[in-house]
């Protein structure tokens, strides 16, 4: 029987129970948080040979080995990974090994074994006969193998029963406990798996079968598992499903599901029956189960119980991640918030549509609303009192709505209101006005002249940059001298420059009122000398690297008809010169002839600027004599060379520690102090561990029911 | 874990109709996909019919579709078999089910069941 998709059992150890009849779990098998002590040689499940997703093991107490539970279980195959992993075994902290004695497949992903402190037995397993690469295991903190003493079935009355491999160097036996081996198949079978008789299963079988070259006795497909056979690819006329099996159209159609996304089924795409159309995907029509190419962004409407959605903080936007179409009111009320205009960004910036109307009041913290970045209708079929559509109300720092020259936004119904917004000049309110097809339509308060833009330089001159002169992480500009009717109100400038691959950037990327900037910002003073242009050496950049670069000027509050004068330049973009390129990353050489080397590499990971050859050199070198000196036909004592690994195991050192000159006859030497690439190492090992940790209790931890 | 009990079982002449009722508790009733099944006496555990957890897909056996009718109230945590031209075959033990996130057509080993509410159909 076929159970899923994905089984969790929590608290209660007689919940196992419903593995009873299951032969596949399809999706994962989560056992976990059991903090009572049970006796668990009761439950036994050998029909289950297959979970398709991962299996995980987090604080069962009183569960010593895996093998009675699960005597059969043959392939986990990985489909999907929790943290990149298909097996995790954590603070289990009764368990003494693994014994899953027939595991011999894990087709995707890496294991993961920590905190177990009474787990031996994990040195005698070769993970590498099941799975492909071994490099991502992590395997820590578990019972220090000299405290395991972990010896395979035979070995004290050395009639050794189980086959050995070679592991870091060391040619030992596999074992999965005192009393079972781990299964090795033939030299003979090559990849494919075999019986339990050594014989060959079919290439289509994955980690066993019933009876040889047969592609309807395995335990486990490589592929897909079709009406009782293993095949490579799905028939006609069926799907791909859950990464194992065929499915046909009807069984897709009638697939229920309890998530949000239900109301219009399962969809066929790409050979697959699937949740939903993947992304860049839309379904062709609203009862279709097949999918179209989007146009453009995927449309996702979003919609508000309540009607009016309040976006008040980085958490609340969340929720409209992806949203392209929002049915409902926007009311936007950011007082305060770290790097809060790239993370709207990241969440607001694919809505295209608010069916309402959208009110920004008590915002300080924003400065421009270009995170909107793809708003382009307002259709006010819901109106504030008074019939506004798009309100602005009481934002300190809002300079700027949107680069006009590049966005049009239409508002198709209701008026716009302005009040109290300081530094928002009435001419950026005036070019809304046009752009969004409302002029005409306000009244005269609704767009207050007095208090918008009384603290804003709004009657903008233009500062024109008059030379520029770049090296390789260098740029050095200089400007005309700006001017204002009086000298005396010129306080300093203000040059803003950053990386700008792309000639798109505008002055408000990135920037908030609470001191995120994607900009970098440096002050320049006024020249002593009036007739010298002012400038700036610009240091420490990077080579081949565009570069948008601006200035302002720094004016006290001189006013004019009731409003600042300021003088701010365009934006210019500039690239600073070519240099060396960083060395060519992985040389290889190999040799392939007795006159012939072959040597690749990768491209450097800095190229500064563009690369158009490569020199290779090379050069002959002596042989080493020390490959003469032994005749290798004899069988005996073949020189082996030790070479010092440059660890030391901590628990050994007991005594103070020697303080002698290392080398020569002095004895034990003292542990080098860690490099900083080492203390480096340990640290990202900390945190990863953390992050692993928190990933862990976040996906596993539920909040009790109501 | 899932509490779900039965009631609404009993006596009804064939042609007859009859609602059964499921009430669940423990967990977020919406994020479960519910089931009916039946037993009769003496044969296997069989499927009688599934909705979606929004309420909006239904799923019905060949052998009543047109005569029952699955329903869900998420705000009263209640599954519903509306079961109409009741015929003597029907008579059966018939048990609520949930099962988390998703159901596929051939699963049987649903995560959580009820105790069962007997239906008799005689005259």
């Known amino acids: 029987e076929i159970c899923g998709p994905g089984i969790d059992i929590r608290n209660d150890y007689q919940q196992l129970k419903r593995l009873e009849n299951c032969t596949v779990i399809e999706g994962y098998l989560h056992i976990l948080l059991i903090s009572k002590a049970e006796d668990y040689r009761s439950y036994r499940f050998p029909k289950l040979t297959v979970i398709t997703e991962y299996l995980l093991l987090f604080r069962v107490a009183g569960l010593e080995s895996l093998g009675d539970l699960f005597p059969n279980l043959t392939v986990i195959r990985g489909w999907k990974l929790f943290y990149n992993y298909a097996l995790v075994i954590f603070e289990m902290t009764n368990l003494k090994d693994i014994g899953l004695y027939n595991l011999r497949n894990i087709t995707r992903g890496a294991i993961r074994i920590e905190k177990n402190a009474d787990l031996c037995y994990l040195s005698t397993v070769d993970w590498s006969l099941i799975l492909d690469a071994v490099s991502n295991n992590y395997i820590v903190g578990n019972k220090p193998p000299k405290e395991c003493g972990d010896l395979c079935p035979g070995t004290m009355e050395e009639k050794p029963m189980c086959e050995k491999t070679t592991i870091n160097n060391e040619y030992n036996y596999r074992c999965w406990t005192t009393n079972r081996c781990q299964k090795m198949c033939p030299s003979t079978c090559g990849k494919r798996a075999c019986t339990e008789n050594n014989e060959c299963c079919h290439p289509e079988c994955l980690g066993s079968c019933s009876a040889p070259d047969n592609d309807t006795a395995c335990v486990a497909c490589r592929h897909y598992y079709y009406a009782g056979v293993c095949v490579p690819a799905c028939p006609p006329n069926t799907y791909r499903f859950e990464g194992w099996r065929c499915v046909d159209r009807d069984f897709c159609a009638n697939i229920l599901s309890a998530e949000s996304s239900d109301s219009e089924g399962f969809v066929i795409h790409d050979g697959e029956c699937m949740q939903e159309c993947p992304s860049g995907f839309i379904r062709n029509g609203s009862q279709s189960m097949y999918c179209i190419p989007c146009e453009g962004p995927c449309p996702k409407v979003c919609e508000e119980e309540k009607k009016t959605k309040t976006i008040d903080s980085v958490t609340s936007a969340q929720m409209l991640q992806g949203c392209t179409i929002f049915k409902g009111n926007l009311l936007i009320n950011i007082r305060r918030g770290n790097n809060i205009a790239s993370e709207l960004e990241n969440f607001m910036g694919l809505i295209e549509v608010v069916t309402g109307y959208v009110k920004i009041r008590h915002s300080h913290a924003l400065v421009s609303l270009s995170f909107l970045k793809n708003l382009r209708l307002i259709l006010g079929e819901e109106q504030l009192e008074g019939n506004y559509s798009f309100y602005v109300l009481d934002n300190q720092n809002l300079q700027q709505l949107w680069d006009w020259d590049h966005r049009n936004l239409t508002i198709k119904a209701g008026k716009m209101y302005f009040a109290f917004n300081p530094k928002l000049c009435v001419s950026e309110i005036y070019r809304m006005e046009e752009v969004t097809g409302t002029k005409g339509r306000q009244s005269k308060g609704d767009i207050n002249t007095r208090n918008n833009g009384e603290r804003a330089s709004c009657e903008s001159d233009v500062l024109h940059f008059t030379s520029t002169t770049t090296s390789k992480n260098r740029i050095i500009i200089t400007w005309h001298r700006y001017r204002p009717p009086d000298y005396r109100d010129l306080i300093s400038f203000t040059v803003y420059y950053k990386e700008a691959p792309f000639k798109n950037v505008t002055e408000y990327d990135g920037q908030d009122a609470c001191g995120s900037n994607s900009w970098n910002m440096v002050d320049v003073d006024l020249p002593p000398n009036k007739d010298v242009e002012p400038g700036i050496l610009l240091h420490g950049l990077k080579p081949w690297t565009q570069y948008a670069v601006y200035v302002k000027a720094v004016t006290l509050t001189m006013v004019e008809n009731d409003h600042i004068r300021g003088a701010k330049s365009e934006i210019l973009y500039i690239r600073t010169n070519a240099s060396v390129p960083s060395i060519p990353l992985d040389v290889l050489s190999a040799s392939n002839s007795s006159s012939q080397l072959i040597v690749k590499w990768n491209p450097p990971s800095l190229p500064n600027g563009n690369l158009s050859y490569y020199i290779v050199r090379w050069q002959r070198q002596p042989q080493d004599g020390y490959l003469y000196r032994h005749n290798y036909c004899s069988k005996d004592k073949i020189p082996i060379r030790k070479y010092a690994d440059g660890t030391i195991d901590i628990e050994e050192v007991t005594e103070n520690p020697k303080t002698e000159v290392c080398g020569g006859e002095k004895g034990p030497c003292c542990a080098c102090p860690k490099t900083e690439a080492e203390k480096q190492a340990e640290k990202e090992e900390a945190e990863y561990r953390k992050v692993f940790e928190n990933f862990l209790h976040n996906s596993i931890f539920v909040p009790r029911p109501e | 874990e899932v509490q779900l009990v039965e009631s609404g079982g009993g006596l009804v002449q064939p042609g007859g109709s009859l609602r059964l009722s499921c009430a669940a508790s423990g967990r977020t009733f919406s994020s479960f996909v519910m089931s009916w099944f039946r037993q009769a006496p003496g044969k296997e555990r069989e499927f009688v019919s599934a909705?979606?957890?929004?309420?909006?897909?239904?799923r019905y056996a060949d052998s009543v579709k047109g005569r029952f009718t699955i329903s869900r109230d998420n705000s009263k945590n209640t599954l519903y078999l509306q079961m109409n031209s009741l015929r003597a075959e029907d008579t059966a033990v018939y048990y609520c089910a949930a099962n988390p996130r998703r159901a596929t057509p051939d699963l049987s080993q649903y995560a959580y069941w009820g105790q069962g509410t007997l239906v008799t159909v005689s005259s």
């Open positions: 909705i979606s957890g929004s309420g909006s897909r239904q």
